[in-house]
Interface confidence: low
């Protein structure tokens, strides 16, 4: 067979047009200049090229560029995004939202790939924190997010971004990641009135220290036993019935149906069972009467 | 699953026009090149032209040059093709065809319509 | 104008192989595509970038391309492989069918 290398008369390309479509691998390496692509790349993505097309634009891009892609390529990678390797995209220096935006807008739908992981590590870390609008965007295409980041990590968002976060933003988060959030969501929400604060800060409570629930307790909020599940054992422990009773207020039914597991089961142990009794839930595991509790964290601290 | 589904089958006079439509059930078409094809009894498969998703584009085989106008209604998810001047050789089922593919593959056909007979005859 | 001929038709006996093949000026620098159509039905796409089978066909279909010639190979064939078979191919803003090959299994 011929060596497919020179441009066939008539077939260089002008411009980035559908006519490209229909040129083998060799004749787009060979009839393409890398020069007319960069400029035309918008023009790209309304192209049906096939997957191994791609693959020689990106060769050519890659010749052109290769201490990384401009910005102004990036923002019109269209499908060629997916093309590209985690190394390939360590190059770039991505600050503008519009193009984070554009790139994700072609991932949509799937789980973030280690392509799409990298890009936002590089964008978040030439922004230098996780601001509102990057936050809103990001939980808008990947609502978990928020909580595939480390502590560390979460600890540059700005508590002004809370309120972009959403409450299915936070399913997957694990105690650590809340006990960074919470103080965070607090001080964002600080201002609203108490049924109103509730509702946004309801996601975070399992960041919440004792001291914060015990407050709660106080201003009728009916907690729901979703969200008491949720909330740190050791936060929970300390808490009464009488507040507990009041934090959850009509749910507080919801404990018998719960009472085998955590932190139900761990708060029932620590209460006295007359106490207990007096919910009339028949919740059964407390302290029977007459014995003495000691308070094994204070004995500690003392010896 | 993705389907196009073309109108009935027609019987023209010579001199005549005939209107064919192609309507996907699926809610992409609008993203995908459409071609037509017919085949006339007993005989091969022979290409008439192609209209890109956004209708504005299209190209016909030479042999039809004039002849046949492909439109496409990008609200209602159909494709139509007229053809003009019909002549009893013009006989022919009439198929519509989609680009779907794997991976943007322009150049095959995989999604084709169930066919429309067109019989001319006076 | 571009054409594309086929062999007109095609025996092979159940299990064995069959190949047809689709001639044209320099078809190995264009893609090749090949379609099965059986009798009264719409025509199904079983090979598409010479080589490619779309989701949904079996492995026994398998094609080439080089030179002058386009090749749809069917290893062990079977009963319900007998049909009517089209090369098709781009050139010069037109699509172009080969002639057709009627496969018999005996």
């Known amino acids: 067979e011929v060596e497919k290398t020179a441009c066939p008369s008539g077939k260089k390309a002008r411009e980035i047009d559908e006519s490209l479509i229909f040129y083998k691998k060799w004749e787009l390496e060979a009839c393409v200049d890398a020069a007319l692509l960069a400029t035309q790349m918008d023009r790209v993505n309304a192209i049906p090229f096939t997957y191994e097309q791609l693959d020689v634009l990106k060769h050519k891009l890659d010749e052109l560029y290769p201490q990384g892609y401009p910005e102004s390529v990036i923002q019109h990678l269209g499908y060629l995004f997916l093309k590209m390797s985690p190394e390939d995209i360590r190059k770039w220096n991505v600050t503008s939202l519009e193009t984070l935006k554009a790139l994700l807008e072609v991932n949509k739908g799937h789980e973030m790939s280690p392509q799409v992981a990298t890009l936002i590590d590089r964008f978040v870390k030439g922004r230098g924190q996780l601001d509102k609008d990057t936050l809103d965007t990001l939980t808008a295409f990947y609502p978990g997010y928020l909580c595939s980041l480390s502590p560390e990590e979460l600890s540059s968002v700005p508590p002004s971004s809370i309120w972009a976060v959403r409450p299915q933003d936070l399913d997957t988060c694990d105690p650590r990641q809340l006990d960074v959030l919470y103080p965070k969501a607090r001080l964002a929400f600080q201002n609203m009135n108490g049924s109103e604060y509730f509702v946004k800060i309801q996601s975070f409570l399992g960041g919440a220290p004792t001291e914060d629930l015990k407050a709660l307790s106080q201003q009728n909020v009916s907690m729901d036993l979703a969200t008491f599940m949720k909330l740190r054992t050791d936060a929970v422990l300390p808490l009464t019935v009488a507040e507990v009773q009041k934090l959850l207020g009509p749910h507080v039914e919801g404990l018998k149906a719960e009472e085998r597991h955590r932190p139900v089961r761990d708060w029932i142990l620590r209460q006295r069972q007359d106490d207990l009794d007096t919910l009339g839930l028949g919740l059964q595991g407390g302290i029977p009467n007459g014995y003495l509790v000691l308070d094994l964290s204070m004995q500690e601290a003392l010896s | 699953e993705v389907q196009l589904v073309q109108s009935g089958a027609e019987v023209k006079k010579p001199g005549a026009s005939v209107k064919v439509s192609c309507k996907a059930s699926?809610?992409?078409?609008?993203?995908?090149?459409v071609h037509w094809v017919r085949q006339a009894p007993g005989q091969g498969l022979e290409w008439m032209g192609i209209?890109?998703?956004?209708?504005?584009?299209?190209t016909y085989a030479q042999k039809f040059q004039g002849r046949v106008t492909m439109t496409r209604d990008t609200s209602t998810s159909t494709v139509y093709m007229e053809l003009s001047s019909l002549r009893s050789e013009d006989t022919a089922v009439y198929y519509c065809?989609?680009?779907?593919?794997?991976?943007?593959?322009?150049?095959?056909?995989?999604?084709w319509g169930q066919g429309t007979l067109v019989t001319v005859s006076s | 104008s571009y054409e594309l001929t086929q062999p007109p038709s095609v025996s092979v006996s159940p299990g064995q192989t069959a190949s047809i093949t689709c001639s044209g000026d320099?078809?190995?620098?264009?893609?090749a595509s090949w379609y099965q159509q059986k009798p009264g039905q719409s025509p199904v796409l079983v090979i598409y970038?010479?080589?490619r089978r779309p989701s949904g066909i079996p492995e026994r279909f398998s094609g080439s391309n080089s030179g002058n010639t386009a090749t749809l190979t069917i290893s062990g064939t079977q009963a319900m492989d007998e049909a009517d078979y089209y090369c098709?191919?781009?050139?010069?803003?037109?699509?172009?069918f080969g002639t057709g090959t009627k496969v018999t299994v005996l």
């Open positions: 065809a989609e680009v779907r593919g794997s991976g943007y593959n322009y150049f095959a056909m995989d999604v």
């Open positions: 699926g809610d992409t078409f609008n993203r995908y090149y």
């Open positions: 209209i890109n998703p956004s209708g504005v584009s299209t």
């Open positions: 320099k078809l190995g620098d264009k893609y």
């Open positions: 970038q010479d080589n």
């Open positions: 098709q191919a781009w050139d010069s803003d037109t699509y172009v």
